[in-house]
């Protein structure tokens, strides 16, 4: 009797088990009693990830440059386009349809992990001991200058945004 | 329900053109499958001779030496056998099948 | 071109036994994906073939579960496990994985 459920990559359709076009591939006509399945390969610029039964390809991710995108990875008849961000951007989500500059650490925070075209500045607070006077997209926080090492002493002590101001020790007269 | 219909003449003279017709009602020969003429001489097995696919492109049996065309007429959902240079040898009953449905046949004479 | 040879030729059976044919082919049936295309029709006297079995071992829509097909790659039997009075006629096999398409040369079954 004809079957109620199919292989894997197989599918049901008119009471036959057809196979699946595979990835790369998108269906022409499904099988029949005394024929398979027909399948043709995707166009340049289109693509299937999956064994599938799609009349038609998907067209690979365009990475528009006036959106800051740029190609990471080519598309293949199996696998779509990667876009990444120019130099100075990250994308705005996982599927990167766009870009935006990457965020400064204001002074008083040191950047704890450098941008990259998919992922954002992560800023940090100098801890105690530390500072950062600048706003900037790549600077740590920086430790407070050791005055004792240079023979002096703190004269102004430091914060997270400023260095400490060492002076010469008062000498005893 | 698919029905298949034959037609053409009856009667074909010797190292001429045997022409059939055959109307498919119930099912559109663009929509999938591949639409065969099968023949029987009389008293004798079945032959294969070739099919029009749904897309149109074309299969035919090598012992038929190049004297076959099928060819259809999508507006009309009907394809078509034409066999050339016919001997006493191509006397027959031609069927036109889907290979699930087939016409009822028609007998075709070679003949002076 | 696939040839396909069925034995017996003929078979007289009484009304309620079984009867079994073979269809052996030239070469494998099997393609690439593992699937097999192998026909069985009965055409009775003065009638087009009607198909029976598909794909080996499919019963086509309304055929009687007395009929049942088996087999693989190069061997194939029909089986009727209870011959009743209309089952009188020639059964053909029929290869449709290789093209050309190629028919067994029947085998003519009779009631005893």
């Known amino acids: 009797e004809p079957p109620t459920a199919c292989r894997e990559k197989q599918y049901l359709i008119n009471s036959q088990c057809c196979s699946l076009c595979q990835p790369g591939q998108k269906l022409v006509s499904d099988c029949t009693e005394f024929t398979e399945t027909e399948c043709l390969p995707c166009s340049e610029s289109e693509f299937l990830d999956t064994w599938n039964r799609e009349t038609r390809c998907h067209q690979h991710k365009y990475c528009d440059p006036n959106l800051g995108l740029q190609v990471q990875q080519k598309g293949t008849s199996e696998t779509d386009t990667i876009c990444t961000c120019e130099e100075g951007l990250h994308c705005t989500s996982e599927s990167c349809e766009s870009c935006v500059p990457h965020r400064s650490c204001l002074p008083g925070f040191g950047v704890k992990q450098i941008a990259t075209g998919v992922s954002d500045t992560i800023c940090e607070p100098c801890p105690v001991g530390f500072f950062s006077n600048v706003s900037s997209a790549f600077e740590k926080c920086r430790p407070w200058t050791s005055c004792e090492t240079k023979d002096l002493v703190v004269q102004q002590a430091g914060t997270n945004k400023t260095d400490v101001v060492c002076g010469p020790q008062d000498r005893q007269r | 329900e698919v029905q298949l219909q034959e037609s053409g003449p009856g009667l074909v003279k010797p190292s001429e053109t045997l022409s059939l017709t055959c109307t498919v009602s119930?099912?559109?020969?663009?929509?999938?499958?591949?639409w065969n003429w099968i023949r029987q001489p009389p008293g004798k097995g079945l032959e294969w001779m070739g099919y029009?696919?749904?897309?149109?492109?074309?299969n035919y049996n090598p012992s038929l030496k190049n004297r076959v065309t099928i060819s259809r007429d999508t507006s009309k959902n009907q394809f078509s056998l034409k066999l050339s240079s016919v001997t006493a040898a191509d006397t027959a009953v031609y069927y036109c099948?889907?290979?699930?449905?087939w016409g009822q046949g028609t007998t075709v004479t070679v003949s002076s | 071109d696939i040839v396909m040879t069925q034995t017996p030729l003929s078979l007289s059976v009484t009304p309620g036994q079984p009867a079994s044919i073979s269809c052996r082919s030239s070469?494998?049936?099997?393609?690439?994906?593992?699937?097999?295309?192998l026909n069985w029709y009965l055409q009775k006297p003065g009638q087009s073939p009607q198909l029976l079995i598909y794909?080996?071992?499919n019963r086509f829509s309304g055929v009687p579960d007395r009929f049942s097909g088996s087999g693989s790659g190069t061997d194939f039997t029909l089986k009727i496990s209870r011959v009743e009075a209309e089952d009188v006629g020639v059964y053909y096999c029929?290869?449709?994985?290789?093209?050309?398409?190629?028919f067994g040369q029947g085998t003519k079954l009779e009631i005893k």
């Open positions: 099948a889907r290979l699930d449905y």
């Open positions: 119930g099912y559109s020969i663009t929509s999938n499958y591949y």
């Open positions: 029009i696919r749904y897309d149109g492109s074309n």
């Open positions: 070469q494998s049936l099997e393609n690439t994906n593992g699937n097999t295309f």
């Open positions: 794909r080996v071992s």
């Open positions: 029929l290869q449709v994985t290789h093209v050309p398409f190629t």
